[in-house]
């Protein structure tokens, strides 16, 4: 079998809401993946599991099942949404994200995704990790790749 390539493209959109009484931020983050099947037979994308981390803490998880199949030598773009909650020990972010004197309230999140594919009863898992900028101050739609965080000073996970 040839490889199945998974490429994390980036954040597509982030929709934000707040709970003043709880000093809590809710971020619905939609991400885009490209999955390429380099084989001469179809493969099933069985599931996608994703999680988002902030300050080394998991703030959101999602799982999609029985997603799609990808034909021979074909590629499919898949969007998946992770609902995240920034609260309690991370509630210092509430002040930053709701501060009206700042135009862009970028925070750095770590996106982790694992894609499970199957073909002829064989299962394969491919994982990706990326740091991304997300604006927690307003609803934002991104150009693909626009939210990539490229700073070499990435925290040790």
């Amino acid at each position: 079998p040839r490889s199945i390539d998974v490429k994390y493209i980036g954040v597509k959109s982030a929709y934000v809401s707040y709970d003043v009484q709880k000093r809590t931020i809710y971020l619905n983050i939609t991400n885009t993946l490209n999955i390429t099947n380099n084989n001469y037979y179809s493969v099933e994308v069985e599931n996608i599991t994703a999680q988002v981390q902030f300050a080394k803490t998991v703030i959101g998880k999602a799982r999609l099942n029985n997603i799609t199949h990808i034909g021979p030598l074909d590629m499919k773009q898949i969007d998946y949404t992770v609902p995240t909650v920034i609260a309690e020990e991370m509630s210092y972010m509430y002040d930053f994200c709701t501060l009206i004197s700042i135009k862009v309230h970028n925070i750095v999140l770590m996106m982790q995704v694992t894609v499970t594919t199957t073909y002829f009863g064989h299962s394969e898992q491919i994982s990706q990790e990326r740091y991304q900028y997300v604006d927690c101050g307003r609803n934002t739609t991104y150009q693909l790749g626009q939210s990539e965080y490229l700073n070499v000073l990435q925290p040790q996970q």
């Epitope: 009484q21 709880k22 080394k56 509630s91 210092y92 930053f96 750095v108 925290p155």
Partner: antibody
């Protein structure tokens, strides 16, 4: 105005336990956390842990996990820290503070002095 | 755990002078740093959090800057009430550690 009123000086024997209280007023108690900090002999500050009264979720510094227990009573807007198995190393001033998250205290109590002596 | 290194340990200055205190994190903490002032025998007071956000009722002569691993607190035109100890504290993950402190004394 926001105020945090801590209980008075505690004198305890080695091996005993003490419970320090921190009564909050001037804000909605369940909106913020309460963080606890230790200061020995006018030296540096050490974060012990914090509690979020809305959910009763607690976050501890590993170093203090077996030493301190944080609780909160929503009805009286009071947070408590119990220190157990006291030794001379626990003699210090203990502060409570309203937490903006992850130990960032924006309003502080006046401090409670705990002295452990036989 | 993330360690915070503060410098200098002590500093002498006169009223009206401008001073800068620095704080270094052992790893990237982005902008998530707070600064406190503590006067002798008193309770700590939050000055700055999220790197440069001034806390309530803090005079504008105080300013925080930096990101990543290097941060500084600048006090313009020192006033008599500014003398005391200053602590940095990261608030990126647990435990949120403090620096050892800087004692600012009147020259």
């Amino acid at each position: 105005q926001v105020q945090l009123q801590q209980s008075g000086t505690e004198l305890a024997r080695p091996g005993a336990s003490v419970k320090v209280s921190c009564k909050a007023s001037g804000y909605i108690f369940t909106t913020y956390g309460i963080t606890w900090v230790k200061q020995r002999g006018g030296q540096g500050l050490e974060w012990i842990g914090e509690i979020y009264p809305r959910s009763d979720n607690t976050y501890y510094n590993e170093k203090f996990k077996d030493k301190a227990t944080l609780t909160a009573d929503k009805s009286s807007s009071t947070a408590y820290m119990e220190l157990r198995s006291l030794t001379s190393e626990d003699s210090a001033v203990y502060f409570c503070a309203r937490s903006k998250g992850s130990g960032t205290g924006d309003y502080w109590g006046q401090g409670t002095t705990v002295t452990v002596s036989s | 755990d993330i360690q915070m290194t503060q410098s200098p340990a002590s500093l002498s200055a006169s009223v009206g002078e401008t001073v800068t205190i620095t704080c270094r994190a052992s790893e990237n903490i982005y902008i998530y740093l707070a600064w406190y002032q503590q006067k002798q025998g008193k309770t700590p007071q939050l000055l700055v959090y999220n790197g440069k956000m001034l806390a309530e009722n803090v005079p504008s002569r105080f300013s925080g800057s930096g990101s990543g691993t290097q941060f500084s607190l600048k006090i313009n035109s020192l006033q008599p009430e500014d003398f005391g100890s200053y602590y940095c504290q990261h608030h990126y993950g647990s435990p949120p550690a403090f620096g050892a402190g800087t004692k600012l004394e009147l020259k």
